[in-house]
Interface confidence: medium
């Protein structure tokens, strides 16, 4: 399927890379505005400047582009434990991440929220915390897996995935339970 | 003016439903993800889920997964989170929240207890 062409994509097209047509007379291309700044008025006519200004504090265009307006710059989410990287310049928008030792964990496309890396108590690192990841951790013996972290054993009850893990625990424990009934 | 008003919280019984509704206005709906936000007494906030646009992809929490469900009604202007199968562990006072780069726009919550 061919994607449907917005108006404005299609009005761009017509002219070549770095231009874009007049909205009131489609005969003129007009040069783009350069990143960091956005459109106060279209060129007059054809080989005539366009009228671009520079984005005010707290706006980007990070990218050429024929927009009215600049972008309003993104706010590092502190709800989510995130901290700023860069602050945002007239091209470019603030760059967002987690502390040291923490990673992201993406809740959609545009939201991350920082968590502490796991450190693999009772465990040992089978894959480091990634930006991205956390750290993935392999449990010593007589400890199992639980949400990212090693639990003792003692704490597996028989309903449980652990069981698979823990049962040489879980028999020893039945054995002594009936071993101190006889 | 941006608003958002929250309303549909009360007290329910474990394992219960509750249907959430946030009524939005002064913004285009449509353009915009929403978020439904929750902070439990005496904690932080926590996401709770998420409906993008367009499309209008839906995200949970693991800790609601299965049991919330996000939607929204673009002719109304209205979010919604249809909860089943509440816990205690589900007692908060729930936000809607308006992403525009940022969770710049908020409701004033709505409360919501799981108690036998």
């Known amino acids: 399927l061919v994607p449907h062409l917005g108006d404005r994509e299609k009005r761009d097209s017509v002219c070549p890379q770095g231009k874009y047509i007049h909205p009131q007379n489609n005969s003129i291309c007009c040069t783009k505005c350069h990143k960091g700044t956005y459109l106060y008025n279209d060129c007059p006519g054809p080989g005539q400047d366009t009228d671009c200004r520079e984005c005010e504090s707290g706006s980007f265009t990070a990218s050429e582009n024929h927009l009215r307006h600049c972008l309003s710059c993104s706010k590092c989410r502190k709800e989510m434990g995130q901290v700023e990287i860069s602050s945002c310049t007239v091209d470019r928008d603030t760059v967002c991440g987690c502390r040291k030792n923490q990673y992201r964990h993406y809740w959609s496309e545009n939201l991350f929220q920082c968590f502490n890396c796991s450190l693999c108590l009772n465990g040992t690192v089978h894959l480091s915390c990634q930006e991205k990841q956390n750290t993935v951790c392999t449990c010593h013996a007589g400890f199992f897996l639980r949400e990212n972290e090693c639990v003792s054993c003692s704490n597996c009850k028989k309903s449980l995935e652990c069981t698979k893990l823990c049962l040489p625990q879980i028999e020893n424990v039945k054995g002594t339970e009936d071993s101190g009934t006889t | 003016e941006v608003q958002l008003l929250e309303s549909g919280g009360g007290l329910v019984q474990p394992g219960g439903s509750l249907r959430l509704s946030c009524a939005a206005s002064?913004?285009?709906?449509?353009?915009?993800?929403m978020y439904w936000v929750r902070q439990a007494p005496g904690k932080g906030l926590e996401w709770v889920s998420s409906?993008?646009?367009?499309?209008?992809?839906?995200y949970y929490a693991d800790s609601v997964k299965g049991r919330f469900t996000i939607s929204r009604d673009n002719s109304k202007n209205t979010l919604y989170l249809q909860m089943n199968s509440l816990r205690a562990e589900d007692t908060a006072v729930y936000y809607c929240?308006?992403?525009?780069?940022?969770?710049?726009?908020w409701g004033q919550g709505t409360l919501v207890t799981v108690s036998s």
């Open positions: 929240a308006k992403y525009g780069r940022n969770f710049d726009y």
């Open positions: 002064g913004f285009t709906f449509p353009a915009d993800e």
């Open positions: 409906i993008g646009w367009p499309g209008g992809a839906t």
